[in-house]
């Protein structure tokens, strides 16, 4: 973010805020970057009763406020000025703050509190399971007790639909009300990327509020699923953790569940999907089981629902295989065994080579003997051949 000077606003109360012959004045320092700013009152001559609050970062810009409490009666002879300095932008601002005359009637300025509207996607499991009904949900919060009822309108790809179920508004702990409307949708409409719009209207709103949602755009990528047995260090405890690692999937909508011998397991927790550097996501799921259940050889299955998968589903099972577990003590013992094994292999190779050499020597000796015998035989026969050639007509 680039260097941005602050805007400074004086904060003066109405007479209703003036109590015990004291008045609190304030200064709002808004929209600056980077930190810090310094706030003084009357160039530092006012220091008691000063509170400067920590800065808050919002949308890459900082905002802070400072207040000073001064006597209101008799009126201070001097005006109260807040002095703001922002070194990074070489900005200095002085704002005079004039407390209102205590005799005036309180000025009541009521800014209409507009309710907030939020739209939520369907649960991934509902979208991918035929016997469940996916629903898009629209929630209106901060409705005042005196506000009239809100009306919901729903649109699928800008075509109005009338199948939503709107619940009666519910009172919240802070005495505001909340209103919820749910639109049951077709599985394929969500998967095909249709847009769902919720329009909320009320006499209390200056204008209707609209919120739109659809499936994350982009090519679905199937997750890789790996199961990880409990670490050996955990085997000293009564409970052990089985882990399911689900990686490289897109979009982030995913359901991860566990089964134990074919029945749903309850005692598991999933992380929220976390984005990889390449834009895909990964999730970990941890199932806690009694060590005795693990050691008994029960089968635990990590079940994953994601639109990128064939059948939108895959699962990986995990069970305790004592013969295949190799812990460090065993590995250390194995190191010793490997030393012995190398000795055995060396002796075996030496003996093998010796036997090959011996066989080769014997074979060569025999071949040489046979060869010399044949040569001798040939020499005794050749003269006779010559004689016969010579006798030819």
């Amino acid at each position: 973010a680039k260097t941005t000077p602050p805007s400074v606003y004086p904060l003066a109360p109405g007479s209703a805020a003036q109590t015990n012959s004291m008045v609190t004045l304030g200064c709002l320092v808004k929209g600056y970057f980077p930190e810090p700013v310094t706030v003084t009152w009357n160039s530092g001559s006012l220091s008691s009763g000063v509170h400067t609050f920590p800065a808050v970062l919002q949308s890459d810009l900082y905002t802070l406020s400072s207040s000073v409490t001064v006597p209101s009666s008799p009126r201070p002879s001097e005006t109260v000025t807040c002095n703001v300095a922002h070194p990074a932008s070489s900005t200095k601002v002085d704002k005079k703050i004039v407390p209102r005359d205590c005799g005036c009637k309180p000025c009541i300025c009521t800014v209409p509190e507009v309710s907030s509207v939020f739209i939520f996607p369907p649960k991934p499991k509902d979208v991918l399971t035929i016997t469940l009904t996916p629903k898009v949900t629209c929630v209106v919060v901060d409705i005042s007790k005196d506000d009239p009822e809100v009306q919901f309108s729903w649109f699928v790809d800008d075509v109005e639909v009338h199948t939503a179920q709107t619940q009666p508004r519910e009172e919240q702990f802070n005495s505001t009300f909340r209103s919820v409307s749910e639109l049951p949708i077709m599985h394929q409409d969500w998967l095909n990327g249709k847009e769902f719009k919720c329009r909320v209207n009320s006499a209390a709103f200056p204008a209707p509020i609209e919120k739109t949602i659809s499936k994350t755009k982009g090519r679905p990528k199937a997750p890789q699923v790996y199961t990880i047995p409990p670490p050996k260090e955990q085997m000293a405890k009564d409970k052990v953790s089985l882990t399911c690692m689900i990686t490289d999937f897109f979009p982030e909508d995913i359901t991860v569940e566990w089964q134990w011998n074919g029945q749903p397991a309850e005692n598991y927790k999933n992380t929220q999907p976390i984005m990889n550097t390449n834009g895909s996501y990964f999730v970990y799921s941890k199932l806690n089981v009694q060590k005795s259940n693990w050691e008994a050889g029960n089968t635990f299955t990590c079940s994953v629902l994601h639109e990128g998968l064939h059948n939108h589903h895959t699962e990986k099972s995990l069970s305790h295989s004592p013969g295949l577990q190799l812990d460090e003590t065993c590995a250390e013992a194995q190191d010793g065994e490997l030393d012995g094994l190398w000795t055995t292999i060396t002796i075996f190779i030496s003996l093998f080579l010796l036997s090959v050499c011996y066989s080769a020597a014997v074979t060569l000796f025999k071949v040489k003997w046979i060869f010399s015998s044949v040569v001798e035989l040939k020499q005794t026969l050749v003269p006779e051949y010559k004689n016969m050639i010579g006798q030819a007509p």
Epitope: Q188, G262, S303, N311, H312
Partner: nanobody, 124 residues
């Protein structure tokens, strides 16, 4: 060749019962979850019920819970949908679909095989 053939549909009065069958051939039913779907006139196809490959897990859409029962007989390579207390809104073409896996889910996509459907009409 792989086939799923639905049968048992017909005209029935409201409150009546029907049993649909999904006969499979060309593959071993033991390894497949089976889902029943229906499509009402002018509407999209929707899931009705699901049974896992072992038969150990069954699921129903809310609108048919307590009225429909899904079951399977792997020896006969057949899956059944017993439909009681039928309502006019149950009218439609009923399809079965097969998913190759042992999970307890019938999902909204990725079916391996589909049948051609059987018509159920609930009317007085």
């Amino acid at each position: 060749q792989v086939q799923l053939v639905e049968s048992g549909g017909g005209l029935v009065q409201p409150g009546g019962s029907l049993t649909l069958s999904c006969a499979t051939s060309g593959f071993s039913l033991d390894y497949y979850s089976i889902g029943w779907f229906r499509q009402a006139p002018g509407k999209e196809r929707e899931g009705v019920s699901c049974i896992s490959s072992t038969g150990g897990s069954t699921n129903y859409v809310d609108s048919v819970k307590g009225r429909f029962t899904i079951s399977r007989d792997n020896a006969k390579n057949t899956v059944y949908l017993q439909m009681n207390s039928l309502k006019p809104e149950d009218t439609g073409v009923y399809y079965c679909a097969a998913y190759r896996r042992s999970g307890a889910y019938c999902t909204s996509g990725g079916q391996d095989y589909w049948g051609k459907g059987t018509l159920v009409t609930v009317s007085s």
